[in-house]
């Protein structure tokens, strides 16, 4: 399986709230030995390896964000932890899975990344992840409402 | 923040089985693999297996014949059961939590296990 | 099975010295590496997750680097506490294997 993400660039203004999203493609197996780790982080575009460093998003590291679930299962992560962060991560029954962040500031702008991890019961363990940038933005160039544009092309779409 | 503690003989037969028990608190069974990894006097680290909160579990072949590994989440503790013991058994037991895709990031302060009759 | 070859398998060194420290795979493990420090009667701790990171807690003076087979632990100035035994372990298949472990006593 791989992740997709379909916005590659999120600009969105101070003060408002914003929804990460990626989506797991292919074939996902959904028997019952088979369970999915998912979570979320900051990091950096490193050298080596995107996504390799695991930062915390405001102060809430991939463990505290991370959702667990069969292949059947949407799932949430703790809620009482990750809104008091302002922060929300979910997963639906169709491989979309998200993180919000309300009341953004400066201090959130960055890369963000969502990591899949496949358990599955004797095998060695399969993880994918995907990257995509956060732009807070504040002053009269910034835009009203969050604008997000695709990975594949450049064409933006505004978001409220 | 999560601590593991582990209990269990600290002496056992040849031919015998071997029990421990991990106890997990300050966090969630749910969130990790739970691995154990012995050390044998003077000697380098050696994974025996792990389970994960879902039942799954994954074993060191050398040693699967003779290892099962289960966990109860009420009681937040899981167990390693080593079968037909020998002295080459004989080896510090340490119970570890391993986040997937990372690391082995908490540790238990180990047990020393000696085979002898 | 993915052997790891730790070498040296012993460092003398003095405290304020560049300590390097060398991993060898028996084929890729990508970036999915990990290095562990063990003192004496303690349970080793994590260093370095994915060859390069620092895990949470641990100074800039360690630092991770390699990519595939061959792996480098570098502590960059010895302090006091940081002679002790050093394992590398791979995480891209199972079993999980550790390295021998590379021990850097005080010369």
């Known amino acids: 399986f791989k992740v997709a993400t379909p916005y590659s660039l999120y600009v969105c203004p101070e003060g408002q709230q914003v929804t990460l999203t990626c989506r797991l493609l292919g074939p996902v197996d959904k028997g019952h030995d088979v369970t999915f780790y998912k979570t979320w982080y900051r990091s950096s575009r490193g050298e080596v390896q995107t996504c390799s460093e695991r930062r915390p998003i405001r102060n809430l590291t991939f463990q505290d964000l991370h959702l667990h679930h069969g292949g059947h299962q949407a799932a949430n992560t703790s809620h009482d932890l990750a809104q008091r962060h302002g922060l929300e991560s979910a997963s639906d029954h169709h491989g979309q899975f998200s993180i919000t962040m309300r009341n953004l500031t400066l201090l959130d702008s960055g890369l963000y990344c969502c990591l899949v991890v496949e358990i599955r019961h004797h095998h060695s363990e399969h993880r994918v992840h995907g990257a995509m940038e956060l732009q807070v933005q504040t002053g009269k160039d910034a835009p009203s409402n969050c604008v997000v544009y695709p990975s594949s092309s450049q064409d933006s779409e505004n978001i409220t | 923040q999560v601590q593991l503690q582990e209990s269990g003989p600290g002496l056992v037969k040849p031919s015998e089985t071997l029990s421990l028990t991990c106890t997990v608190s300050?966090?969630?069974?749910?969130?990790?693999?739970w691995s154990w990894i012995r050390q044998p006097p003077g000697k380098g680290l050696e994974w025996i297996g792990y389970i994960y909160y879902s039942g799954s579990t994954n074993y060191n072949p050398s040693l699967k014949s003779r290892v099962t590994i289960s966990v109860d989440t009420s009681k937040s503790q899981f167990s390693l059961k080593l079968s037909s013991v020998t002295a080459a058994d004989t080896a510090v037991y340490y119970c570890?939590?391993?986040?997937?895709?990372?690391?082995?990031?908490?540790w238990g302060q180990g047990t020393m296990v000696i085979v002898s009759s | 099975e993915i052997v790891l070859t730790q070498s040296p398998a012993t460092l003398s060194l003095s405290p304020g010295e560049r300590a390097t420290l060398s991993c060898r795979a028996s084929?890729?493990?990508?970036?999915?590496l990990a290095w562990y420090q063990q003192k004496p009667g303690q349970a080793p701790r994590l260093l370095i997750y994915?060859?390069?990171n620092r895990a949470t807690g641990i100074p800039a003076r360690f630092s991770g680097s390699g990519s595939g087979t061959d792996f480098t632990l570098t502590i960059s100035s010895l302090e006091p506490e940081d002679f002790a035994v050093y394992y590398c372990q791979q995480r891209i298949n199972w079993p999980l294997t550790f390295g021998g472990g590379t021990k850097v006593e005080i010369k």
């Open positions: 994915d060859a390069f």
């Open positions: 084929q890729s493990v990508s970036y999915y």
């Open positions: 300050g966090g969630s069974i749910s969130s990790y693999y």
């Open positions: 570890a939590s391993d986040i997937p895709a990372f690391a082995f990031d908490i």
